[in-house]
């Protein structure tokens, strides 16, 4: 007869591992024992338990609770045992030392791998503004064993780098993502993607990229200025600007307080019916906690008594 | 005073595409990201996805393979389309403006202003 | 089955407070900022809260909010009926399903 196990049993922390042990034998033949030990090199052997056909399962003090039989039906030649709730220390080699009658002992190794599935974290960088070079976005550290994969995923343009950590059981792998923050990168998500063997599937995390900017300011309303005339009802002057985070407007009057009756209504400004008084320079003031920016334009409110000469020139020229 | 309001078909048939849009009034699009959400009769709230003004986009993963939210810059509105609808895609959908900034230690994320949502019935 | 865990209804009588919780974890509450959403039955949800405890304008100083770890509450002192309402709890959520995740809701009704 001979021996059939595996020479590697690979289990996920805190799983149960199944140390496979079966003698094939003829007919005829009986198990009447199997011991298994533990028998890393450099080390004496440490026996775990012993499976006796007459009198059952004897754990040893130091796997109490840990090491079972498998569920029946069980095959009287079948000596495989279960250890349940496998740790990173349990990772190693272990022998089966099979008696048999009338045959004798038949023994054989296998290696217990224990894989140690990461837990990624993501740390993004400091904030991201218009203008810096190039900056860390985010890194993401995950500690496995064996050592896990770290990527990135995204449309964003950058560059990344990793280091790696051995300990004695496991290792740990960092990866940077850095890059030239721009404006066309908000809202972009950047994900960290860890694979491990001890993983169904990968892990990701993602950090939605912000980058802080304000755009120049520019007023949109004086493009006709022969529309600013006493009387006209409904004239407006807009601020136009960009930013993240998006940005307040304010407005004032350069030559001094706002006329009564503008009203103020956040990136507009509402005349009341044009008089003199509402020619002026106004001043919008755009800001965020980034930057601030101000734009100013002149208004010249016309009289068309004062026009009328000229306009009639101009007609009868024409 | 900005205000949103949702448009679009209150009925689309299986396997079909609904497609809302959102027009914002009273303000600029610019600078804002702007969201869908949407909530089944007598359920929670569910993030569909955002749109950034500039055009970039993040969809909820469990929608992903069926959304397009698109913005026009021009005309102050956005739109969500959702392909290959079912019964439970009978929801009340809402546009809405987030908030969204991260201040390098977490995220700064509302949504502050929203539309009356429509109500959209999948059924042949 | 919502991210973030609410408790489905609470209630008191009116002039008394109530609290609501919102629970979740480290890729979500943990991290970031939460907001809270006040709902009535066949209208839009309007921000109640913002930045884990800002109020908007309008908001009146009876609604407070406060975050703890990987857990959130909504205060709501000096009951009036007008508050019966569905209130929802929001944050980002970075992890697998990388999203801005809701609460269940939960129902106020004020005795």
């Known amino acids: 007869g001979e021996l059939e196990t595996s020479d590697v049993v690979t289990v996920v922390l805190g799983q149960d591992a199944k140390l496979p042990c079966f003698y094939r034998g003829d007919s005829g033949e009986q198990v009447g024992q199997v011991a298994w030990a533990r028998v890393d090199a450099g080390e004496g052997a440490q026996e775990l338990a012993l499976l006796h056909s007459k009198y059952g399962l004897h754990v040893s003090p130091a796997y109490e609770g840990r090491v079972e039989q498998p569920p029946p039906p069980r095959n009287p030649l079948d000596g495989s045992v279960l250890l349940r709730n496998a740790v990173q220390a349990d990772e190693g080699e272990y022998e089966c030392r099979v008696s048999t009658f009338p045959a004798g002992s038949f023994q054989a190794r296998l290696r217990l791998r224990v894989l140690v599935p990461p837990l990624p974290s993501l740390n993004p960088g400091p904030a991201l503004e218009e203008g810096q070079g190039l900056t860390l976005a985010a890194s993401c550290t995950a500690e496995g064993s064996p050592a896990p994969s770290v990527t990135w995923d995204t449309e964003v343009k950058g560059t990344t780098s990793s280091r790696s950590f051995k300990h004695s059981r496991s290792a740990a792998v960092t990866s940077e993502f850095h890059l030239v923050p721009s404006r066309s990168m908000n809202g972009q998500p950047l994900t960290c993607v860890v694979s491990h063997p001890g993983l169904l599937q990968d892990q990701r995390i993602t950090h939605i990229l912000h980058v802080s900017f304000l755009a120049e300011a520019s007023v949109r309303g004086l493009e006709d200025q022969n529309l600013w005339h006493i009387g006209r009802e409904g004239a407006m002057l807009k601020c136009l600007s960009e930013g993240q985070p998006p940005p307040s407007y304010n407005w004032t009057r350069l030559d001094g307080p706002l006329p009564s009756g503008v009203r103020v209504d956040g990136d507009t400004l509402g005349f009341p019916p044009l008089t003199t008084e509402h020619s002026g320079i106004y001043v919008c003031h755009v800001s965020n906690e980034f930057s601030s920016r101000d734009s100013q334009v002149t208004v010249d409110v016309l009289d068309p008594q004062e026009d009328s000469g000229k306009q009639v020139d101009l007609v009868s020229a024409s | 005073q900005v205000q949103l309001q949702e448009s679009g078909p209150g009925l689309v048939k299986p396997s079909e595409t609904l497609s809302l849009t959102c027009t914002v009034s009273?303000?600029?699009?610019?600078?804002?990201?702007w969201s869908w959400i949407r909530q089944p009769p007598g359920k929670g709230l569910e993030w569909i996805g955002y749109?950034?003004?500039?055009?970039?986009?993040n969809y909820n993963p469990s929608l992903k393979s069926r959304v397009t939210i698109s913005v026009d810059m021009s005309k102050n509105q956005f739109s969500l389309r959702l392909s290959s609808v079912t019964a439970a895609d009978t929801a009340v959908y809402y546009c809405?403006?987030?908030?969204?900034?991260?201040?390098?230690?977490?995220?700064?994320?509302?949504?502050?202003?929203w539309g009356r949502g429509t109500l959209v019935t999948v059924s042949s | 089955q919502s991210v973030l865990t609410q408790p489905p209804s609470v209630s008191a009588a009116p002039g008394q407070k109530v609290t609501i919780s919102c629970s979740g974890s480290?890729?979500?509450?943990?991290?970031?900022?939460v907001s809270w959403y006040q709902q009535f039955p066949g209208t839009a949800p309007k921000l109640l809260i913002y930045?884990?405890?800002k109020r908007p304008s309008g908001i009146p100083d009876r609604f407070s909010g406060s975050k703890s770890g990987t857990s959130a509450t909504l205060g709501i002192t000096g009951l009036q009926t007008g508050d019966e309402a569905d209130y929802y709890c929001?944050?980002?959520?970075?992890?697998?399903?990388?999203?801005?995740?809701f609460g269940g809701g939960t129902k106020l009704t004020v005795l």
């Open positions: 480290s890729s979500n509450i943990g991290n970031n900022y």
């Open positions: 930045d884990n405890n």
């Open positions: 929001g944050t980002w959520d970075s992890s697998l399903n990388a999203g801005w995740v």
């Open positions: 009273g303000g600029s699009i610019s600078s804002y990201f």
């Open positions: 749109i950034y003004y500039s055009g970039n986009t």
């Open positions: 809405a403006r987030d908030f969204h900034h991260y201040d390098g230690s977490a995220y700064r994320w509302y949504f502050d202003l």
